[in-house]
């Protein structure tokens, strides 16, 4: 599998979507896990709806959401109010049985966010009528490794 | 706190419809979906169905597809439930209620009901 | 479709008592993901459902602990190990291991 990047900013929500076969995928189950290391194993974060058919509401743990589109074959994972710890190498995973198949792999960056230098008198924050969920903006942008490009730092 | 707050009761005649509203408050409204369920002395406690806040997409029981309609309106964080076609037997108290998909994995909170007498 | 029976159908109680509802499910609630999706509601006179027990036997925010679930697979408990007058309405267990289905209702009261 070939890793894509996604970039996001700290403090806002970062958007992730693995898109894969409706058909093949059909009636299983989809997960979030976060990879421990090179060789190591890829821990849960969060899967989709206990019921298959209700894959389309948002399952979280913490800040993360998932949500599946089973008849398009896009799974979606928002990762809110990112922050640099979130910074690493994640799957999209299809679950059946005990086993798991790799959808992609993810390698999610954390950037600076810029609004951090400027002045407070320049910040915006949403009125009191206004839901946090109308205020914040879901921003990837996602590429792919370049062949050679080592998803985790060399350890000495 | 959080608080679903549910329209008033409602007196229709057969054959028509009625729609009927749930405001959540104290709350993300789009990160929890909501149900709606029917309360008849007959049936005690039935599932209609529940619909993605975020998305609108929508699962029913079997039994409710053709009679009950659920929607949203993100923008003043409310669900909605139109029933058409009403006849006696949908004389019930309606209550909408929220899904939490955090860890509880239940219908955590409830609003106050509204009920519907269907009568000529 | 899953049915889940509850007995009894009434219990009457002294306040102080211990009072134990059972329910039964004609289909496993255990899920793949290791969880068994069954909960317990209160609907006390004149009000909404309330949810009491969460997965079988967590207790939601606020419940106090003398209620209790238990089960597994398909038989589950709820008991109440001290009555009081707060706790009398009608429970209802729930399952949402096969889309969404509330078992009849068991109605606790005054003896």
């Known amino acids: 599998h070939n890793t894509t990047v996604f970039q996001g900013v700290a403090g806002q929500s970062l958007q992730v979507s693995c898109p894969y076969d409706s058909m093949k995928h059909w009636g299983r189950r989809k997960a979030w896990c976060r990879q421990l290391g090179e060789k190591g194993p890829c821990q849960r974060v969060v899967s989709t709806h206990n019921l298959w058919l209700l894959s389309f509401l948002r399952r979280w743990n913490g800040s993360t959401a998932i949500t599946d589109d089973t008849l398009g074959g896009t799974l979606t994972i928002t990762l809110r109010n990112l922050q640099p710890h979130d910074a690493g190498l994640y799957q999209c995973q299809s679950l059946h049985g005990s086993e798991a198949d790799t959808l992609r792999k993810v390698l999610v960056e954390v950037l600076a966010d810029p609004l951090d230098h400027r002045d407070a008198g320049d910040l915006w924050f949403p009125g009191e009528s206004e839901s946090f969920e109308d205020a914040h903006v879901e921003h990837s942008i996602s590429r792919s490794l370049l062949e050679g490009e080592i998803p985790f730092p060399p350890t000495s | 706190q959080v608080q679903l707050q549910q329209s008033g009761p409602e007196l229709v005649r057969p054959g028509v419809s009625v729609k009927i509203s749930c405001k959540g408050s104290g709350y993300t409204f789009t990160d929890y979906a909501m149900h709606w369920v029917k309360q008849s002395h007959a049936k005690s406690l039935e599932w209609i169905g529940v619909?993605?806040?975020?998305?609108?997409?929508?699962n029913y029981n079997q039994k409710f597809k053709g009679k009950a309609t659920m929607t949203v309106d993100k923008s003043s964080s409310t669900a909605y439930m139109e029933l058409a076609r009403l006849t006696s037997e949908d004389s019930a108290i309606y209550y909408c209620?929220?899904?939490?998909?955090?860890?509880?994995?239940?219908?955590?909170?409830w609003g106050q009901g509204t009920s519907v007498t269907v009568s000529s | 479709d899953v049915v889940l029976t509850q007995t009894p159908l009434s219990l009457p109680v002294n306040i102080g008592d211990q009072a134990s509802i059972s329910c039964k499910s004609t289909?496993?609630?255990?899920?793949?993901?290791?969880?068994?999706?069954l909960d317990w509601y209160l609907q006390k006179p004149g009000q909404s459902p309330q949810l009491l027990i969460y997965?079988?036997?967590n207790r939601f925010s606020g419940v106090p602990d003398r209620f209790s679930g238990s089960g597994s697979g398909t038989d589950f408990t709820l008991k109440i190990s001290r009555v009081e007058a707060e706790d009398l309405g009608v429970y209802y267990c729930?399952?949402?291991?096969?889309?969404?289905?509330f078992g009849g209702g068991t109605k606790l009261e005054i003896k």
């Open positions: 209620a929220r899904d939490d998909g955090h860890y509880v994995y239940a219908m955590d909170y």
């Open positions: 997965l079988v036997s």
């Open positions: 289909k496993s609630l255990l899920n793949s993901d290791g969880f068994t999706y």
């Open positions: 619909i993605s806040t975020y998305s609108s997409n929508t």
């Open positions: 729930f399952q949402s291991n096969y889309l969404y289905t």
